[in-house]
């Protein structure tokens, strides 16, 4: 197992529709055409994988369908976005990224984006 | 190293409205936040609402709504805080500070607002 | 919207004295997001404490943070001159990201 840099955002504040989207970076060492990656969110000490997808390079990646992320890929970047998030989902969302074929592998894990995450504020009653 | 820099002090009259800049300097601008932060003479820190450098997405203060705006400016790694409809209680120290992942460090020197008739 | 008090509003203390101050929320929140200010008249505020418990670079180890829940303490373990200051709390796990009302340490 070898060592690669994964670069991400220190910070996003999702959208008030719930969704965050970020990059996710890595040096790849070499011509890699299997690649897994991996979101897994750390709060309070606890790690927790959000989502994953294996793609071939050049291909969309393909979360399972009841997953959270969706994503796109091109060249060494993976643009992950993640829906359906609440305020109690605020957290450090760690992107992890595995060169899977051909050999050797390569695991990179990035240091986090942390995403909060506001609940919208309810709207006031109003009369009809 | 990294380093946040404020306008000047501005003095105005009410109903006027104001925009502070917050240069960052020594850091990916686009991977954090900034906050901006009030203090009323001698008075405590009042937190106003915050940027997402890297998407523009915004939170504010709920009784600031309305009357605030905060925006960035990716090309020279700035970022500005406009307050409208000023009022003599606005007249505060404003300052900006680095968004982390659990943190706000550093913080801006500060800019100072005197709105008066 | 969390609610922080602080306790107490002032404290005299001597150098070489330890001081203990409170910070307390009116719900129960993530550690993860409780951080201390140190405020001296005429600057910017300066972090110290993040996550309730660690020190910002640069920090010296007689300032220490505490807590869980809802009571977050910082504790400055011997009294340099230099520390006598405001220093607030604040929360940033839910929005508004509130600060606590300060507690001035002054010299007796």
């Known amino acids: 197992c070898k060592a690669m840099h994964v670069a991400q955002p220190a910070v996003v504040l999702a959208s008030s529709r719930g969704i965050a989207s970020f990059v996710c970076e890595y040096a790849s060492p070499g011509k890699a055409t299997e690649v897994r990656v991996t979101v897994l969110r750390q709060a309070d000490s606890q790690v927790t994988e959000v989502c994953a997808a294996t793609y071939m390079m050049g291909n969309e990646l393909t979360f399972l369908d009841d997953s959270i992320c969706t994503g796109t890929s091109s060249g060494n970047q993976v643009n992950l976005t993640i829906q359906g998030l609440r305020a109690m989902d605020t957290g450090l969302y760690i992107c992890k990224v595995e060169l899977m074929y051909p050999p050797p592998y390569y695991l990179g894990i990035g240091n986090g984006t942390q995403i909060y995450v506001i609940d919208p504020e309810p709207c006031p009653d109003s009369d009809f | 190293q990294v380093q946040l820099v404020q306008s000047g002090a501005e003095v105005k009259k009410p109903g006027a409205s104001v925009k502070v800049s917050c240069k960052a300097s020594?850091?990916?601008?686009?991977?954090?936040?900034i906050s901006w932060v009030r203090q009323a003479p001698g008075q405590g820190l009042e937190w106003m609402g915050w940027?997402?450098?890297?998407?523009?997405?915004?939170n504010y203060a709920q009784k600031l709504q309305g009357r605030v705006t905060m925006t960035t400016d990716t090309s020279t790694n700035t970022a500005y805080m406009e307050l409208r409809s000023l009022r003599s209680d606005d007249t505060a120290v404003y300052y900006c500070?680095?968004?982390?992942?659990?943190?706000?460090?550093?913080w801006g020197q500060g800019t100072l607002v005197t709105v008066s008739s | 919207e969390i609610v922080l008090t602080q306790s107490p509003g002032t404290l005299s203390l001597s150098p070489g004295e330890r001081a203990t101050l409170s910070c307390r929320a009116s719900?129960?929140?993530?550690?993860?997001?409780l951080a201390w200010y140190q405020q001296k008249p005429g600057q910017a505020p300066r972090l110290l404490i993040y996550?309730?418990?660690s020190r910002a670079t640069g920090i010296p180890d007689r300032f220490s943070g505490s807590g869980s829940g809802t009571d977050f303490t910082l504790t400055i373990s011997r009294l340099e001159p230099e520390d006598f200051a405001v220093y607030y709390c604040?929360?940033?796990?839910?929005?508004?990201?509130?600060f606590g009302p300060g507690t001035k340490v002054d010299i007796k």
């Open positions: 500070a680095r968004v982390g992942a659990n943190w706000f460090d550093p």
């Open positions: 020594g850091y990916t601008f686009t991977s954090y936040g």
């Open positions: 940027i997402s450098a890297y998407n523009g997405n915004t």
């Open positions: 719900q129960s929140g993530s550690s993860s997001y």
């Open positions: 996550g309730a418990s």
């Open positions: 604040q929360q940033y796990g839910s929005s508004p990201f509130t």
